[in-house]
């Protein structure tokens, strides 16, 4: 790969601290190995939806299915774990749904709920119709998958009604759940039919049953739960971004970069430049030249707006991003036209991360 | 599973430069920066810089700039850390850790001496 | 520079007690801190990156939050395996700075 050299004396070190960013969380869905996975695009009104993983296009192949709205990944590897993104773009602007997908040994997804309404779970009976346990919202029990980050807060419910009134106990793996089991122990709560782990760890994988009984019968239902747990991630960039741009000379243009990073991630834009007619330094390496970088001085650094553009504009632009723990770059080609030449939105072009696994 | 092994301890001469090796398995050595960081006698840590071997992009701790070199060798995973000009006060344990600081290596002792 | 300010710089305490480390930033360096800790004769370990992530293998009983410039490492029942001395660092911006280190003792 190769390196650069700078001119104008710019430095690709940040020289004051970078400007803050919000960083978004995105949903985590989990399969097993072997298993397959259908996710929906959570976007409305898309013309066009595009897909990549860790920043990179996802198209068609043997095992990825790209239907609609759809993405079906069949006989899941834990290869396929990652960052996704679909993508839907629209005839004025583009809208992004990030979701994290982890293929393990351990399957699930999910979030926990408030337990503000548990209290119509609770069902009284006549006391002249004796029934067997059932369940009295299944809605609440649909999701058995449940994929939550270590030190989260785990809930799973299984309201249900019965007469008598059944009693409710949890087996993990298929034996007795008991409190000295999990290190802080668990809550149950019979009003809301609920268990309750807080701060969970990674010994607590694996299923939890719920077995509620009366003397006219017993139902059960499993969920299973993964704990997923969090490793430093170097920055990953949308895929297609910066796309590439055409505009006449005196024209106005705008380059987009969007960035996904836990850790405070620095934002440079950089263009391939001559010195003394030349593209190269004597030691072979392309001139480069900091154009914008994101620090107290620098609005939205995400994106580089080129005013008034000459020919000189024209060229690649690359959109670098680094964190303590990496760096990622995309770039994309502004083409600059005669003032009689009509501007058109190019075609865009994915341009090929530098980063690839 | 991520590895980082050090080279082995060394003792030089006040005025002399030393040059410290760090091997990395177990992951893809382009992906993550390679920091170098060192700890004196009793005292705490202090980072002197990085190394992101994708594209030989570094940045030091000013306080070192000018006197250490980070470099790597992508075709043995290799990183190099070099200080020069060495001091009494350079008496330290040199480590090297990726990226993400998550992982470490053993640390190399430099002892500067006359 | 951003300054690392720890405190305490020693602390005793006895297996099973709860205790807290604190880390202040000389500036605004929302949850960009990791935790180390670090035995005789050792290289630190990665205990909490990003204020609050509890690294992979990190049992539970360590905890980081924080946020801007103020932020804490909680152990909830010290064993003994956790007598070491504990560093913070910001990640936010180059030079990244560690804290002086605090050093928990058996009481």
């Known amino acids: 790969r190769p390196s650069f050299s700078l001119v104008e004396d710019t430095t690709l070190e940040p020289e004051e601290p970078p400007t803050k960013y919000q960083i978004s969380q995105p949903e985590v869905y989990v399969a097993a190995p072997g298993e397959s996975l259908e996710v929906r695009c959570l976007l409305k009104d898309a013309a066009v939806i595009s897909w990549t993983k860790d920043g990179v296009h996802l198209g068609p192949n043997n095992r990825t299915v790209l239907i609609g709205e759809y993405l079906q990944i069949k006989g899941a590897t834990p290869r396929d774990s990652g960052l996704y993104a679909c993508t839907a773009s629209r005839t004025v602007d583009s809208e992004t749904w990030y979701f994290m997908v982890n293929v393990t040994d351990a399957i699930s997804s999910g979030d926990d709920e408030d337990d503000t309404d548990g209290a119509e779970d609770f069902v009284s009976e006549n006391s002249n119709n004796k029934r067997a346990p059932y369940w009295t919202n299944t809605e609440k029990m649909e999701k058995r998958l449940h994929a939550v980050p270590a030190a989260n807060t785990v809930k799973f419910r299984c309201p249900a009604g019965g007469n008598p009134m059944p009693t409710m106990r949890w087996l993990k793996n298929g034996k007795e759940f008991k409190q000295e089991h999990r290190i802080g122990g668990y809550k149950v709560r019979n009003q809301h039919w609920s268990l309750i782990m807080e701060s969970v760890v990674p010994s607590d994988k694996g299923n939890y049953t719920c077995v509620v009984e009366n003397e006219y019968g017993s139902i059960n239902h499993t969920y299973h739960l993964d704990v997923v747990e969090r490793s430093p991630h170097r920055p990953i960039l949308q895929a297609g971004l910066p796309a590439n741009a055409s505009t006449v000379v005196g024209g106005d243009v705008e380059f987009v970069c969007k960035v996904y990073s836990d850790a405070q991630p620095h934002i440079q834009w950089i263009k391939h430049v001559e010195k003394n007619g030349s593209k190269y330094g004597p030691d072979g390496l392309p001139y480069l030249k900091v154009l914008k970088h994101s620090g107290i001085n620098s609005s939205n650094a995400e994106v580089l707006a080129l005013f008034n553009v000459t020919e000189a504009d024209a060229g690649e632009y690359i959109c670098k991003v680094s964190n303590y723990i990496g760096q990622a770059n995309q770039s994309a080609w502004l083409t600059v036209l005669p003032k009689q030449q009509a501007p058109g939105r190019e075609k865009e072009i994915t341009a090929s991360p530098d980063y690839l696994e | 599973q991520a590895q980082l092994v050090q080279s082995g301890a060394e003792v030089k001469k006040p005025g002399a430069s030393v040059k410290v090796s760090c091997k990395a398995s177990g992951y893809t050595f382009t992906n993550y920066n390679l920091h170098w960081v060192r700890q004196a006698p009793g005292q705490g840590l202090e980072w002197m810089g990085l190394?992101?071997?994708?594209?030989?992009?570094?940045s030091y701790n000013q306080k070192f700039r000018g006197r250490a070199t980070l470099t790597v060798d992508r075709s043995t995973s290799t990183a190099y850390m070099e200080l020069s000009s060495l001091r009494s006060e350079d008496t330290a344990v040199y480590y090297c850790?990726?990226?993400?600081?998550?992982?470490w290596g053993q640390g190399t002792l430099v002892t500067v001496s006359s | 520079d951003i300054q690392m300010t720890q405190s305490p710089s020693s602390l005793s305490a006895s297996v099973g007690d709860r205790v807290t480390i604190t880390c202040k930033a000389s500036q605004d360096v929302t949850t960009n801190v990791a935790w180390y800790q670090q035995k005789p004769g050792k290289s630190p370990k990665l205990l909490i990156f990003s204020a609050s992530y509890r690294f992979t293998g990190v049992p539970s009983r360590f905890s980081g939050s924080g946020s801007g410039t103020d932020f804490t490492l909680t152990i909830s029942s010290l064993q003994p395996e956790d007598f070491a001395t504990y560093y913070c660092?910001?990640?936010?911006?180059?030079?990244?700075?560690f804290g002086q280190g605090t050093k928990l003792e058996i009481k």
């Open positions: 850790a990726r990226g993400g600081f998550d992982y």
């Open positions: 190394i992101y071997p994708g594209n030989d992009d570094t």
């Open positions: 660092q910001q990640h936010y911006g180059t030079p990244y700075t």
